[in-house]
């Protein structure tokens, strides 16, 4: 198909950064300022993305590639190609419709983005809580309570060696 297209389409060989100009008998013309074509054979150039407001320019637009945006400090990217900027919160908080709110008891968030998640339930794995959770940190699970009972040891001593012909006393 590609070979057929290239034989039939007089525009197929205009390089990236140009467009096939129907107003000039289908010769290749450079993309105008603030526009780009990232592939060859284009009949138009695309308008460059502008990083305004809460967006800032991470990579300038060129004749062959679009501008890339990220977010100003205090915000982070969401969506493909950083299509949105969302406000950062502190660790131990989550963003709600009313702004940043502290994590409820029993939940935590160790990042400036995302939602508060429940602490790990150590008992589900038969373990005990070694370090309590906070709004910013998950609990740390330790050994199971049985492993910590008096006299219990995680290492089993080797059986005593017996000489041949002797029965235990």
């Amino acid at each position: 198909f590609e070979r057929t297209r290239s034989l039939q389409d007089p525009c197929s060989n205009c390089p990236a950064g140009t467009f096939c100009d129907n107003n000039r008998n289908q010769i290749c013309s450079p993309c105008p300022p603030n526009s780009f074509s990232s592939a060859g054979g284009q009949r138009t150039c695309d308008i460059c993305r502008q990083c305004k407001g809460v967006f800032r320019t991470r990579k300038e637009c060129s004749s062959t590639s679009n501008a890339e945006c990220d977010c100003t400090p205090g915000f982070h990217c969401l969506g493909a190609g950083c299509s949105m900027c969302e406000q950062d919160c502190k660790q131990g908080q989550e963003l709600t419709k009313k702004g940043c709110k502290d994590c409820c008891f029993g939940t935590f968030n160790d990042q400036k983005r995302g939602i508060c998640r429940p602490w790990t339930n150590c008992s589900l794995d038969g373990k005990s809580v070694l370090v309590n959770g906070t709004k910013e940190r998950d609990v740390v699970c330790g050994p199971s309570p049985a492993d910590l009972s008096p006299g219990a040891s995680s290492v089993t001593p080797p059986a005593p060696a017996r000489e041949p012909g002797h029965s235990p006393q």
Partner: nanobody, 121 residues
Framework: EVQLVESGGGEVQPGGSLRLSCAAS????????MGWYRQAPGKRREFVAA???????VYAESVKGRFTISRDNAKNTVYLQMSSLRAEDTAVYYC???????????????WGQGTLVTVKP
Amino acid sequence: EVQLVESGGGEVQPGGSLRLSCAASGFSFSINAMGWYRQAPGKRREFVAAIESGRNTVYAESVKGRFTISRDNAKNTVYLQMSSLRAEDTAVYYCGLLKGNRVVSPSVAYWGQGTLVTVKP
């Protein structure tokens, strides 16, 4: 406005050489393919050679090994170096700006006015 101005034509003996030039203006020369065509008296215009922006070249079978097409993007000029000329090379030679930077089955968007090459003993 696109302009293509050929020069370098003239009379030459069989086996001789000539270099044709085509000075281009009014468009982005470096991103477009250019071609040479010729029209002998009483015959149809025919393809001779073409060169694309990336310098890939294509030649008509009748001129392969004898003619060389080249370009100087800094001077917006395309050249046709012709050697081992024969009587059947006698024609008006035209420079063409090709559509879509294509040298495979090319079609011409704009023509120059032509320059006459005569090969005779």
